[in-house]
Interface confidence: low
């Protein structure tokens, strides 16, 4: 899988896992989550090479297709697969609000 | 949606629907399946700016973090979303074989 | 600001090997593609080939066999290792980079954008 | 391989007029519109101009114009500017090709 435990061990051009830390404030402008004040989002990066990591049959095509014709500009893309969700707390005038947000962090990536 | 129908009628260079023809022969190199020939696999290409067609809450705050640090590599990517299967023809020896290809044809794109 | 900056030209003799580097900033070559270029003195354009971001090299057919191009990610540089070198082989050699329309690669497009200034490698005895 | 022939050669235009540049390949570019035109001034790299046989490319002035399509390509320039004396090359971009890309041989435009 292209998740952290393979990817932020190994030194990988193709898709992959790679670290981001988001700060709420300084990197979305969100003044409105108390904490935390920012958290390890990650994204996925890289090249998608013939059969590394497809996701369906069409990206598979697709690879192979860019194999043969690497100048073409059809060619997969190395996206999210697994998420997570994100528990933050947030204030509505003095009252404090706890809730998860869906798919905020990036687990493993593939090629699609 | 980015579909044939919004994507082709206009000049996008977000991400949308591009057309493609894949001959199975050329530029595939598969000489296996006698038909068709090749067929309208199509594919997403184009920018993924805040807010265009996001997929998740992930790509809504990578998209936003683009927009306030451009120089950064972390940003969504177009990838398919609704693919299509594809009926083709092949021959084992003598005997004909009609099998249906799934997740062959990209029928709209998203941002991830 | 991307940028691509050519070094390791010079004077080599007939016969000789030179090693060209391509340092790029502001992109990454996981990302794109990388082209060399050259133009003898007076003369047109002259394609020789490219490493794509997945790292694949390609050449056109009267480049095949003399000249190499690889690259290093980490280092974010491309390089073009020319051998057997003839005085027809002068010339001032450019990297290109294929540019990026709306974040989809342009590929065979032929959209090379930005350039390199270029160096200079003259061969002769 | 392609061959892409370039002519005139030279051409020496008044302040104001119209030039014209034409192109033709050996043999069909890629998706028949993989066709780019570079200006190139002493001393300096080409610049791209127009890709994709007739898209400008960002902060190019609107009095350049490129048309064509398979074989036949052409480069206008609608009011030639004494900032437009330079030499101006198209390049095209091949599938199934041995040599992916070939550059015409080069139009010298000069102020009448």
């Known amino acids: 899988a292209l998740d952290a435990a393979y990817c932020f061990r190994n030194v990988q051009d193709n898709c992959c896992l790679r670290p981001l830390y988001i700060d709420f404030k300084r990197d979305l402008g969100w003044k409105w989550i108390h904490e935390p004040k920012g958290y390890n989002a990650n994204f996925c990066a890289g090249a998608c090479p013939y059969l590394w990591s497809s996701d369906t049959q069409h990206s598979r095509v697709l690879s192979l297709y860019n194999t043969i014709n690497p100048e073409a500009s059809a060619s997969p893309c190395c996206v999210s697969q697994d998420l997570e969700p994100l528990t933050i707390l947030y204030y509505i005038g003095k009252t404090p609000k706890i809730e998860q947000l869906s798919n905020m962090i990036v687990k493993s990536c593939k090629c699609s | 949606a980015l579909d044939a129908a919004y994507c082709f009628r206009n000049v996008q260079d977000n991400c949308c629907l591009r057309p493609l023809y894949i001959d199975f022969k050329r530029d595939l190199g598969w000489k296996w399946i006698h038909e068709p020939k090749g067929y309208n696999a199509n594919f997403c290409a184009g920018a993924c700016p805040y807010l265009w067609s996001s997929d998740t809450q992930h790509s809504r705050v990578l998209s936003l973090y683009n927009t306030i640090n451009p120089e950064a590599s972390a940003s969504p990517c177009c990838v398919s979303q609704d693919l299509e299967p594809l009926t083709i023809l092949y021959y084992i020896g003598k005997t004909p074989k009609i099998e249906q290809l799934s997740n062959m044809i990209v029928k709209s794109c998203k941002c991830s | 600001e991307q940028q691509l900056v050519e070094s390791g030209g010079g004077l080599v003799q007939p016969g000789g090997s030179l090693r060209l580097s391509c340092a790029v900033s502001g992109f990454s070559l996981s990302s794109y593609t990388v082209n060399w270029v050259r133009q003898a003195p007076g003369k047109g354009l002259e394609w020789i080939g490219y490493?794509?971001?997945?790292?694949?090299?390609y050449y056109a057919s009267w480049a095949n066999g003399r000249f190499t191009i690889s690259k290093d990610s980490a280092k974010n540089s491309v390089y073009l290792q020319m051998n057997s070198l003839r005085a027809e082989d002068t010339a001032v050699y450019f990297c290109a980079r294929h540019m990026q329309v709306g974040g989809a690669p342009t590929g065979s497009m032929a959209a090379f954008d930005p350039w390199g200034p270029g160096t200079l490698v003259t061969v002769s005895s | 391989d392609a061959v892409l022939t370039q002519s005139p050669d030279s051409l020496a235009v008044s302040l104001g007029e119209r030039a014209t540049i034409n192109c033709q390949s050996s043999?069909?570019?890629?998706?028949?519109?993989?066709l780019s035109w570079f200006q190139q001034k002493p001393g300096q790299p080409p610049k791209l101009l127009i890709y994709g046989a007739s898209t400008l490319t960002s902060g190019v002035p609107d009095r350049f114009s490129g048309s064509g399509s398979g074989t036949d390509f052409t480069l206008t320039i609608s009011s030639l500017q004494a900032e437009d004396v330079a030499v101006y090359y198209c390049?095209?971009?091949?599938?199934?090709?041995?040599?992916?890309?070939?550059f015409g041989g080069g139009t010298k435009v000069e102020i009448k």
């Open positions: 490493i794509s971001y997945g790292g694949s090299a």
């Open positions: 390049a095209g971009g091949y599938s199934g090709s041995s040599d992916k890309y070939a």
């Open positions: 043999q069909s570019v890629y998706n028949n519109n993989y």
